[in-house]
Every structure is written in C-alpha cells, then in structure tokens.
Interface confidence: medium
C-alpha cells in the first residue's frame, strides 16, 4: 500500500480551505474525546481509477468519494480520516483531510474525493472514512466502511497497468497439450520476447480423488533472440497407471521484472471418457506411486505421433 506522489492531492474546494496530511491512523480525538462530534459520511463509494506517474507508469488507484449529511453537525466537522486496510496483510495506510475553515451549508451537498491510494491487482481492501473529531467512547459511530475488490491481471483493463505488466500479464503462452501414444504428453507454448528460463510443471491425479499420483518438473533454458515468440515443446512420459490420467500443466516464466513471482498459466487435461465395458481397475492401483522422472525437453520436438486430445488455453 502506498500513496501516489504526483500530482499532490487536493481537498480544498469552493467555500472550504483544506489540506491533505499523512496520518498515523490514530487521530488525536481518540485520546482527547470531544463533546460535540459530526455525523457519519453518506454514500461512500469506491471505484477503480487509473493514474499515470511522471515516469509514465500506469497504476490502479482507489477512487474514494463520499458526501456529507445535511444536518447541523457539519458545523463541528474538522476534517476526515481516510483509511485503507489490505485484508490479506493487515497493512493499513491513512491520510487526513484537515479543514482550515468552517463548513457552511450551501445550495448543494458537500462532496469529497480522494484518488491517491495505489492498490494491487487481485487484492481486497477495506476502505473507511472517519469524520473528525471521532466520537466519544459510547457515541454513535461517525464512519462508513466499504470492502473493495481489485480485479486481477487477467482483466483487460488491469492487464496494461505497470504492476501487471511487470508480472508478465502481456505474455499469452497459448498453451496446447496433446496426448500422444506410449503414455506421453506433449506441451507446447509460445515463448515471450525475453531471454529468460521457463519451468513446465506437470501434476497428475486420479479421476476420482484429488491426491496427486505423479508429478514432473521440466526446465526450459532461456531462448535466444531468434526464438522469441516461437513455440517451445516439452514431452512428458506419464505414469504407467491408466487411472492416473487427470493432468494439470503449468508454465512458469522467470521474467526479469518478476523473477519467481511471475504469473503462471495453466491448463488441465481431463481423463478420457471410458465406456461401461472397461475392466475395473485393481485396488492396488489406487496407491499413489511416483514414476521415475524421465522424458525429453527441448524447443523443437519432431515426435509427430498422432494425438488423441487437443486442449487449448489462453
């Protein structure tokens, strides 16, 4: 969680002198309660906007908007504390609107906005606006909170933001999987335009249970420039047990911008549909056994055996 450093946030508007200050999230009115406190915000809304930095980066930001209730308590309103809590880390960031003049009723409802909290893809936040001073210990609450879910990098509008591009969002590997003869699986995907290694992970499951019965990891060395955007092929030798047939394939890149934290792309291959006449599998076959990690891995795979399944994934 952080604040945009440009442009400087503004809270002043016609009829109100105001400045935005960093806050410790612990307003003085908690420690020194006041007798008269303002009512709570009205119609708190949070939207996802996008902000360009001076360096040309594009970041998703939480656009916070609220209005004041039309009661006499605005005469005691000294400002507002805006708090954003990232739910999975409990990290909190606050700013304070400090009113430098008294509010007066005017012909339209007072409305405030703030768009400087930078948010992360696929994260959930709790946004709270507290009117200041905060209420006395047994007083009515004068804050409003809303949860806010930021789309992940798969989303078209998030895809072009700097944090998403840094994690490889623009790379579309277009993974295809072919089931070959002789217990083999060929995985093919498109390389990105960076000389960086990849890892292809295969994990197999039985159709009826969700425990893994086989797994293999294959490394692909960093491609040369002439191989950028070309297809890479990896062939896996599968478990010899026919029931270990539900395959989950992941391609993990190691781009320089995200290293071990790059977005992974995955595809699943379901077990083939079997007719009712199939011989039931022996009970012993249910014991998960690990196969030797064999099979070849390279860019060009001339093994052109007929495939029985084709699975595509974006």
């Amino acid at each position: 969680l952080r604040l945009l450093d440009f442009p400087a946030p503004v809270c002043a508007q016609e009829g109100l002198s105001c400045r935005v200050k960093n806050s410790t999230c612990l307003d003085d009115s908690w420690i020194h309660p006041r007798n008269l406190t303002p009512s709570s915000p009205k119609d708190l809304q949070i939207q996802l906007h996008f902000a360009h930095t001076q360096q040309g980066d594009l970041f998703p930001v939480a656009h916070i908007e609220w209005t004041l209730q039309t009661d006499a308590s605005i005469l005691y309103l000294e400002g507002a504390e805006l708090s954003v809590l990232q739910l999975n880390t409990n990290e909190r960031l606050c700013v304070r609107f400090e009113f430098l003049s008294k509010l007066r009723h005017h012909h339209r409802r007072w409305r405030f906005t703030f768009s400087h909290f930078v948010v992360d893809p696929d994260q959930e936040y709790e946004v709270t606006v507290h009117h200041l001073p905060k209420p006395i210990p047994d007083g009515d609450p004068n804050h409003q909170s809303k949860n806010f879910l930021v789309p992940d990098c798969e989303h078209a509008r998030m895809k072009v933001t700097t944090p998403c591009m840094s994690s490889g969002s623009l790379w579309d590997p277009n993974i295809t999987v072919e089931t070959l003869e002789a217990h083999q699986l060929r995985v093919s995907f498109t390389l990105w335009n960076e000389s960086t290694p990849y890892q292809v992970l295969l994990e197999s499951f039985s159709d009826s249970e969700n425990h893994s019965c086989f797994d293999v990891v294959k490394q692909i060395f960093a491609p040369r420039q002439e191989e950028f955007h070309q297809r890479a092929n990896v062939t896996f030798t599968l478990s010899k047990f026919h029931w270990c047939c539900h395959h989950h394939v992941q391609v993990q890149p190691f781009f320089s911008s995200c290293l071990n934290d790059c977005l992974r792309h995955a595809v699943t291959v379901p077990c083939p549909v079997i007719s009712n006449t199939t011989v039931p599998k022996p009970v012993a076959d249910y014991i998960p056994l690990w196969e030797p990690r064999s099979g070849s891995s390279d860019y060009k795979d001339d093994d052109d055996k007929g495939s029985s399944h084709h699975h595509h994934h974006h």
């Epitope: 996802l48 360009h52 656009h63 809303k146 806010f148 879910l149 789309p151 989303h155 994934h313």
Partner: antibody
Framework: QVQLQESGPGLVKPSETLSLTCTVS????????WNWIRQSPGKGLEWIGD???????NYNPSLKSRVTISVDTSKNQFSLKLSSVTTADTAVYYC?????????????????????????WGQGTTVTVSS | DILMTQSPSSLSASVGDRVTITCRAS??????LGWYQQKPGKAPKRLIY???SLQSGVPSRFSGSGSGTEFTLTISSLQPEDFATYYC?????????FGPGTKVDIK
C-alpha cells in the same frame, strides 16, 4: 447526459487514410476509456480499439498496423486514423464510451467489481472507400 | 481472440412471446459481458451489463443471466418495439469481441 458525435469525411479513396473525430459533450472525457467500433454493410460489429483519457491505447490485432487512436482532453475529443484503406473498410463507424471499473453493491456493504462495457454510443457515421 | 457465438442467428416470434437468446464464449470471461439491441440505421443500445444487471431506463422484461462461458438474454413478453437485432459483447480480454447477432422478427 453525455453525448457523442462522430465527424469526418464520408468518402475516402483507396490507399488513403481515414480520419474521424468523436466529440464528447455533456460530460468530461476523464476517467473513461473511449472506443471506436465499426459495422460493415450487412455485417456484425467489430471493435477497432480504445484510448484511455490519459493516452494509453489498445488496438484490435487485426487492424493494429493501420490504426492510430489519439485523445485531446482540452477539446473533449478523441480521434481515429486508419491508414491504407481498401473497400473492405467501408462501414458505419461508431465511437463509444466505456465506463470506469466500478463496484456493484452486494449484500451488506460488500462490493464486487464489475466493468461497465460500452454504455454510451455516438449515432455513427458512414465512411465509403471508393475511387 | 475470444470467439463469441450466438444462437439462434434469427428467430420469428409474436408479441407476448417469451424469447431466449444464448451467447457462448470460447473461453471463460467471468461476467464481463453486455447485451445490446440494434435497430436498422441506429447505434446499438445497451440493455444488460455485467451479464445480469439491467441498464437504467431499460424495461424489466429484459433480463440476463450466466457467467463464465454461457450467457442468456431473455425477453419475458415480446413487445412490438423489441423487434431488432441483439448482440452480446465480451469486454474481458482484448480484443473485445461481439457475437454475430440474433435477428428477432415478427412471425
């Protein structure tokens, strides 16, 4: 209420550049994406590309090599340029706004995001490519 | 690109009929889908956004449902002004793509 109005020449010669402008009235161009879509005679709708008010663009890969979309926030306008046109580019060209990513108020105070899509369209302008 | 298919491509119906149009995406698009109505010589008009939310000002006889890859537009009781072509639009992945359209005409 926001309104969009396309403008530009109705006739363009093959190999030349088609230029259209969309003027936004009744609202600000800020915090929205602005799209160009076309519809060839008797055909379906094809998204050409879009521009964010800050200048970031996305183009349809099928047209990317020929398309440029730009924005002029001071005039509340955005523009389309399509180079090296052929008769296949004869179509009705629409400009459209698509909304901010916003939030749907679910149960209680919980908010889920949704993405508005194209909510406001211009009435369209016919462009014929012919010598 | 995500391919959007619509069925049927055309249908004939009478005033008062219940009409259902289906749109399928070639891959999952969550609920990032809108339904549009277009009449001859006019721009498309959005009826449904986020797969199931009714656009402000649109009659409640229009409804949308679905998520992922399969979506439905339903007109509960067809009115004379509803005879038009209907398109779905996915805006989950670039390039955004429209369905080929479903023409609803008078039986």
């Amino acid at each position: 209420q926001v309104q969009l109005q396309e403008s530009g020449p109705g006739l363009v010669k093959p190999s030349e550049t088609l230029s259209l402008t969309c003027t936004v009235s009744g609202g600000s161009i800020s915090n929205y994406y602005w799209n160009w879509i076309r519809q060839s005679p008797g055909k379906g709708l094809e998204w050409i590309g879009d521009i964010y008010y800050s200048g970031s663009t996305n183009y349809n890969p099928s047209l990317k090599s020929r398309v440029t979309i730009s924005v002029d926030t001071s005039k509340n306008q955005f523009s389309l340029k399509l180079s090296s046109v052929t008769t296949a580019d004869t179509a009705v060209y629409y400009c459209a706004r698509d909304g901010e990513l916003a939030n749907y108020y679910g149960s209680g105070s919980y908010q889920f995001y949704y993405y508005y899509g194209m909510d406001v369209w211009g009435q369209g302008t016919t462009v014929t490519v012919s010598s | 690109d995500i391919l959007m298919t619509q069925s049927p491509s055309s249908l004939s119906a009478s005033v008062g009929d219940r009409v259902t149009i289906t749109c399928r995406a070639s891959q999952g698009i969550r609920n990032d889908l809108g339904w549009y109505q277009q009449k001859p010589g006019k721009a498309p008009k959005r009826l449904i956004y986020a797969a199931s939310s009714l656009q402000s000002g649109v009659p409640s006889r229009f409804s949308g449902s679905g998520s992922g890859t399969e979506f439905t537009l339903t007109i509960s009781s067809l009115q004379p002004e509803d005879f038009a072509t209907y398109y779905c639009l996915q805006h989950n992945s670039n390039p955004f793509t429209f369905g080929p359209g479903t023409k609803v005409d008078i039986k």
